[in-house]
């Protein structure tokens, strides 16, 4: 995939942006007590463009699309208490902790390290 | 797909934008004389976001991606002169004429009607 676009000559005053915003995330599981954790979400406006196609195609289709997604994340265990379950009093859930975000090719799988 | 996002509560000063820009397109074909035509290309910054995932997933993955692409286009014939081809002195090429553009779900096939 081509590298992400941060600036466009046609729109010198416009810049792509993609931020990691602090959020409070509720982690839940059926029959267990939910937990609130601090995390981050990715949010932004990346560039995309589409140049008209031809038939037969003279070149590769000139379509570009970047999307704001995790550039680095790790998976942590969050343990939930499940008082109603004698057999399974605790449940571990994996939660993606987003470290930082960037504009990346839309089709690209986000960098979920372990998944 | 969810509808495109034009505004985000977190960033009230930011707006999605997606424009149809006038361009001069060169239409060519092997052994034929290229032609310049007036056309439009789509260009913009649509919103995208990614909320951290969990395993097992509690809800649907909260990932949203819009991309600037043709919302309406039509295909026209452009005839090229091919002086070196006695058998095929002229060749018709189909060219997508973009009418207007909009932020649409990234996975969506753009409205290239026939391709």
């Amino acid at each position: 995939a081509p590298p992400p676009i941060n600036k466009l000559a046609l729109f010198p005053d416009k810049s792509a942006w993609c931020e990691a915003k602090n959020i409070t995330q509720i982690v839940g599981h059926s029959g267990c007590e939910a937990k609130s954790i601090q995390n981050r979400a990715c949010l932004g406006q990346c560039f995309s463009y589409s140049v008209p196609n031809t038939f037969p195609q003279s070149t590769e289709s000139l379509v570009h699309c970047d999307s704001c997604m995790p550039a680095q994340s790790m998976w942590e265990i969050v343990t939930l208490e499940c008082p109603g379950h004698e057999e399974v009093p605790r449940v571990d859930k994996l939660v993606e902790k987003i470290v930082h975000c960037s504009c990346q090719a839309c089709g690209k799988e986000p960098s979920h390290e372990g998944l | 797909a969810p509808p495109p996002i034009n505004k985000l509560a977190l960033f009230p000063d930011k707006s999605a934008w997606c424009e149809a820009k006038n361009i001069t397109q060169i239409v060519g074909h092997s052994g034929c004389e290229a032609k310049s035509i007036q056309n439009r290309a789509c260009l913009g910054q649509c919103f995208s976001y990614s909320v951290p995932n969990t395993f097992p997933q509690s809800t649907e993955s909260l990932v949203h991606c819009d991309s600037c692409m043709p919302a309406q286009s039509m295909w026209e014939i452009v005839t090229l002169e091919c002086p070196g081809h006695e058998e095929v002195p002229r060749v018709d090429k189909l060219v997508e004429k973009i009418v207007h553009c909009s932020c649409q779900a990234c996975g969506k096939e753009p409205s290239h009607e026939g391709l």
Partner: antibody, heavy 120, light 111 residues
């Protein structure tokens, strides 16, 4: 003179995929300036264009059929093929392969046609 | 429902002339070349005229095509029994549902 010959099953069950092949003789499918087409004709009705393919593999489909149509080319065998998915009785027709000259509106050479019936 | 409109049938005696009309719009006939095809019973269509008024080699000059505005016409002079067939006009349509379009066909009967 170029000749085109359609081949494939004459009977297809509803919801299945119709597959036809067109074998070209008397000319190379790879010679530039020709677009290779599929056209169909419902019994007792008019002609309906399905799509074009160029030897490079570039395709253009009838928008009303696009979601179900795939046209592919095999230059080594001098053949091009049609696949039409999720067929119903309404897809029962004579299917023609054809050569469209470098002028898109000029379908110069046609195959003899093959009748495909969609029925269980 | 065909994008291009043709009369369902026309008829004339041997030796007479018939004309078949094909009516469209600015997105098809108005801005593109028209071709005409002849389909004899039980056979594949055959190209009769292209680029509005040109004939491929081997097509007699009894067949002539013309175009004016958003309509096209096929003329057949010196009608013969062998001309009894279905005739179709065709062109490109550059509207939003772009593609190669045909008329509904006209049955020519030789009386």
């Amino acid at each position: 003179e170029v000749q085109l010959l359609e081949s494939g099953p004459g009977l297809v069950k509803p919801s299945q995929t119709l597959s036809l092949t067109c074998t070209v003789s008397g000319g190379s499918i790879s010679s530039g300036g020709y677009y290779w087409s599929w056209i169909r004709q419902h019994p007792g009705k008019g002609l309906e264009w399905i799509g074009y393919i160029y030897y490079s593999g570039s395709t253009y489909y009838n928008p009303s059929l696009k979601s179900r149509v795939t046209i592919s080319v095999d230059t080594s065998k001098n053949q091009f093929s049609l696949k039409l998915s999720s067929v119903t009785a309404a897809d029962t027709a004579v299917y023609y392969c054809a050569r469209t000259n470098s002028r898109i509106t000029m379908i110069a050479d046609w195959g003899q046609g093959t009748l495909v019936t969609v029925s269980s | 429902q065909s994008v291009l409109t043709q009369p369902p049938s026309v008829s004339a005696a041997p030796g007479q002339k018939v004309t078949i009309s094909c009516s469209g719009s600015s997105s098809n006939i108005g801005n593109n070349y028209v071709s005409w095809y002849q389909q004899l019973p039980g056979t594949a269509p055959k190209l009769l005229t292209y680029d509005n008024n040109k004939r491929p080699s081997g097509i007699p000059d009894r067949f002539s095509g013309s175009k004016s505005g958003t309509s096209a016409t096929l003329g057949i002079t010196g009608l013969q029994t062998g001309d009894e067939a279905d005739y179709y006009c065709g062109t490109w349509d550059s509207s939003l549902s772009a593609g190669h379009v045909f008329g509904g066909g006209t049955k020519v009967t030789v009386l």
